[in-house]
């Protein structure tokens, strides 16, 4: 997701950029996050891209990655989750959006969320 | 039960800038949608804006983009409404209200604002 | 913007009486309108979503329902605390629209 969007923030070069200052100490720094699993609308891929790119220039400015698995780790396990949750329920959703693949960036017309799946206690 | 409680309305100048706040309890708040809704002095209702759960999306009418604002605390479970540039039309009641599947379920009692000199 | 007409805007009738109350669309909003009870103390309650569904705790004798691009909200017995401002709401797309609203009165 954080790749897609915003190319003037340059964010896979910046980050490959850190991870070869940082090699010897960060092996896993210059793995690729899998997002395959998830799919956001534009929103929230811009918004996700622009929390991407304050968390590296943290880390630019501190020339440390070490918080680097931790801040993908969060994005996979709750901030991901919450952005498709809102993307495919009211009120941004109603009978149809466009999504995002967030490893392949490609959009597709999909289905929102049925009532139980949004609000599970209705 | 769900309560939501509106308040920060007052008088204030035309020019003049207001934040509303609504007190949400009784449900889980970051769970669910939420709106304002404002009702004229001839009683017309007039949607004013809708935040999304963890605020990623908001949405307004085009006549009040720019100087309103909604914004949603939900550690606080509060929704608030920044309101600048106030000119004599936006004189009315501003309820707070929840989004479920089909728009807004509950509504709070609403808060007066008025834009006089 | 999808306007909504509301009809009557007011409207006197007998306790026990059978009323109904229309809002007409401009576009095509699917089943996406919700009908409001609005009470002289300005509480407002949801009565009825998505065009036919009863909200829970509303008494049986209000409907929804639609034809074509008119919603209906029929009250099949008029009771005296139904005497009260009513108002439609399309929620298919943003901006959200209400009706004008409808005040029912005691004849």
């Known amino acids: 997701c954080v790749f897609c969007r915003l190319p003037a923030h340059d964010l896979s070069g910046r980050l490959a950029r850190l991870c070869s200052q940082m090699e010897a100490r960060q092996k896993e720094c210059g793995a690729s996050p899998d997002f395959s699993a998830f799919a956001l609308d534009e929103v929230s891929m811009n918004k996700v891209t622009e929390k991407t790119h304050r968390v590296l220039r943290v880390m630019e400015i501190k020339e440390a990655v070490s918080s680097l698995p931790s801040y993908w780790s969060w994005l996979r396990k709750t901030k991901l989750p919450e952005y498709t949750r809102e993307a495919l329920c009211p009120p941004a959703c109603r009978g149809s959006t466009t999504l995002y693949n967030c490893s392949t960036c490609k959009g597709t017309e999909v289905s929102c969320w049925p009532r139980k799946r949004c609000f599970p206690g209705s | 039960e769900v309560q939501l409680v509106e308040s920060g309305g007052d008088l204030v100048k035309p020019g003049g800038s207001l934040k509303l706040s609504c007190a949400a309890s009784g449900f889980t708040f970051s769970t669910y949608g939420m709106s304002w809704v404002r009702q004229t002095p001839d009683k017309r209702l007039e949607w004013v804006a809708t935040i999304s759960f963890y605020g990623t999306h908001t949405y307004y009418p085009d006549i009040l983009k720019g100087r309103f604002t909604i914004s949603r605390e939900n550690a606080k479970n509060t929704l608030y409404l920044q309101m600048s540039s106030l000119k004599s039309e936006d004189t009315a009641m501003y309820f707070c209200?929840?989004?479920?599947?089909?728009?807004?379920?509950?509504w709070g009692q609403g808060t007066s604002v008025t834009v006089s000199s | 913007d999808i306007q909504m007409t509301q009809s009557p805007s007011s409207l006197s009738a007998s306790l026990g009486e059978r009323v109904s109350l229309t809002c007409r669309a401009s576009q095509d909003i699917g089943s996406n309108l919700n009908w409001l009870q609005q009470e002289p103390d300005g509480t407002i309650k949801r009565l009825i979503y998505?065009?036919?569904s009863l909200d829970s705790g509303v008494p049986k004798r209000f409907s929804g329902s639609r034809s074509g691009s008119d919603y209906s909200l029929t009250i099949s017995s008029l009771e005296s605390e139904d005497f009260v401002d009513y108002y439609c709401l399309q929620y298919a797309i943003f901006p959200y629209t209400f009706g004008g609203g409808t005040k029912l009165e005691i004849k």
């Open positions: 998505a065009t036919s």
């Open positions: 209200a929840r989004e479920d599947y089909d728009a807004m379920d509950y």
